[in-house]
């Protein structure tokens, strides 16, 4: 039994790492391997992560974490019963996939304005909350020509865009997704999307 | 919100011992170490050790080897500090401070004097 | 005695920029990350930068942090009488990281 494909590693520096890797041949991971890790820190235990299969010959792993800081490195060691297949280490803070964003909302009720709202994915005190910026898509599928990101900068989980500048009488989505500039970091995945119905019409000129 | 209630201050003769309490609540006890800290009338200050919850595992500054214990009890999401064979110069104000970096808030600080 | 170093005071008037900084060496700063507290007087201490340069939620923007080879720096814009407090430096020591030291400190006056 040999790994193919050594294993990857990211964290949303919150609470779990995703680490992922292929094998030799076809392996049923729960039932042949384990990934050892420990927090190469004083006082740290050793941890077992047991492996899904991720096709035939991958393998996923969801590692716990807690109080992720930039300084933490941990050692990862993948064994097949007795037999050690790899030894690595992995430093969350430099393979950071940040949560996606949730509760995307479009309230239509504001005047001549659509705002889109969304949550931050992590609570006030995590180190993540104050660096995320965002990306917000909208796109329509009665237009398949209009598809257009909106970088949000600035910390507030809002956007407003003019209702005049989208068609009217057409259906929209809207879906958001984060990043984290201090870290680095690699795009969220997408927020599940959300649909409106634009009805503003402009005024009759005078 | 996170919160963390140290015991109430403390009067001790020589060579006694000191057992202060850091209450946690509003986050998941185990999943953040837990530092003790002190700082002397006027003076800065000073690192002491640091437990890890889950386990109970630690480790003491060199200067208090030997003379701090720390504890915890995690059905009442409670660390312990106890200091033994006090002298005059652990009078101080002892804080309690969660996560590797310290995060906010701490303790509010538990007075210790130390005096004959 | 602390092995990282601050001056005792520092002092300047309300709207005016303050640095205070703090030396170490290569088995702290230099192979760590710094973090920065404030002690208000009477109060517990808080945390007001960590990683160098990063700021927890609820920090004004008006304090920054740097850190070059051993040394590491707190700057403070804007001044304000509020400002007026103990700010100690700390990091993390030893391979593995098993102690944490705090700086001497440094009394911040505000005239």
């Known amino acids: 039994m040999k790994v193919l494909q050594e294993p990857t590693c990211v964290s949303d520096y919150m609470s779990i790492s995703t680490c992922e890797w292929k094998m030799g041949g076809p392996t049923n991971c729960s039932a042949e391997l384990r990934l050892l890790y420990q927090l190469v820190f004083q006082s740290s235990e050793t941890h077992t992560c047991v492996p899904e299969n991720n096709g035939g010959v991958g393998c996923v792993c969801h590692l716990l974490m807690d109080d992720v800081v930039s300084m933490d490195n941990y050692t990862l060691d993948l064994w097949a019963g007795q037999q050690l297949l790899w030894k690595g280490s992995f430093k969350p803070s430099e393979h950071v996939k940040p949560r996606a964003p949730g509760n995307l909302t479009v309230h239509t009720n504001v005047s001549d304005t659509v705002l889109l709202t969304w949550s931050n994915p992590y609570p006030p005190d995590n180190y993540l909350y104050n660096d995320l910026t965002y990306a917000v898509n909208i796109w329509s599928e009665n237009d398949p020509a209009y598809s257009r990101i909106h970088n949000v900068t600035y910390l507030k989980p809002t956007l407003r865009i003019p209702a005049s500048t989208l068609k009217s009488g057409i259906s929209y989505r809207a879906r958001v997704r984060a990043w984290a500039q201090h870290y680095n970091t690699t795009w969220s995945e997408w927020s599940p999307s959300t649909k409106w119905y634009n009805s503003y019409r402009e005024p009759f000129e005078q | 919100q996170v919160q963390l209630v140290q015991s109430g201050a403390e009067v001790k003769k020589p060579g006694a011992s000191v057992k202060v309490s850091c209450k946690a609540s509003?986050?998941?006890?185990?999943?953040?170490?837990m530092h003790w800290a002190r700082q002397a009338p006027g003076q800065g200050l000073e690192w002491m050790g640091i437990i890890n919850p889950s386990g109970g595992s630690t480790s003491y500054a060199q200067k208090f080897q030997g003379r701090v214990t720390m504890t915890r009890d995690t059905s009442t999401s409670t660390v312990y500090m106890e200091l033994s064979s006090l002298r005059s110069e652990d009078t101080a104000v002892y804080y309690c401070?969660?996560?590797?970096?310290?995060?906010?808030?701490w303790g509010k600080g538990t007075l210790v004097t130390v005096s004959s | 005695q602390s092995v990282l170093t601050q001056p005792p005071s520092v002092s300047a008037a309300p709207g005016q920029k303050v640095t205070i900084s703090c030396s170490g060496g290569s088995s702290n700063i230099g192979n760590s990350y710094v973090s920065w507290y404030q002690q208000l007087p009477g109060t517990a201490p808080k945390l007001l930068i960590y990683d160098n340069n990063k700021r927890p939620s609820g920090i004004p923007d008006r304090f920054s942090g740097s850190k070059s080879g051993t040394s590491a720096t707190l700057a403070i814009t804007g001044l304000q009488t509020g400002d007026e407090a103990d700010y100690y430096c700390?990091?993390?020591?030893?391979?593995?990281?098993?102690?944490?030291?705090f700086g001497t400190g440094t009394k911040l006056t505000v005239l």
């Open positions: 401070a969660r996560g590797k970096l310290l995060k906010n808030p």
């Open positions: 509003g986050y998941a006890f185990t999943s953040y170490y």
């Open positions: 700390g990091t993390w020591f030893g391979t593995p990281a098993s102690n944490y030291v």
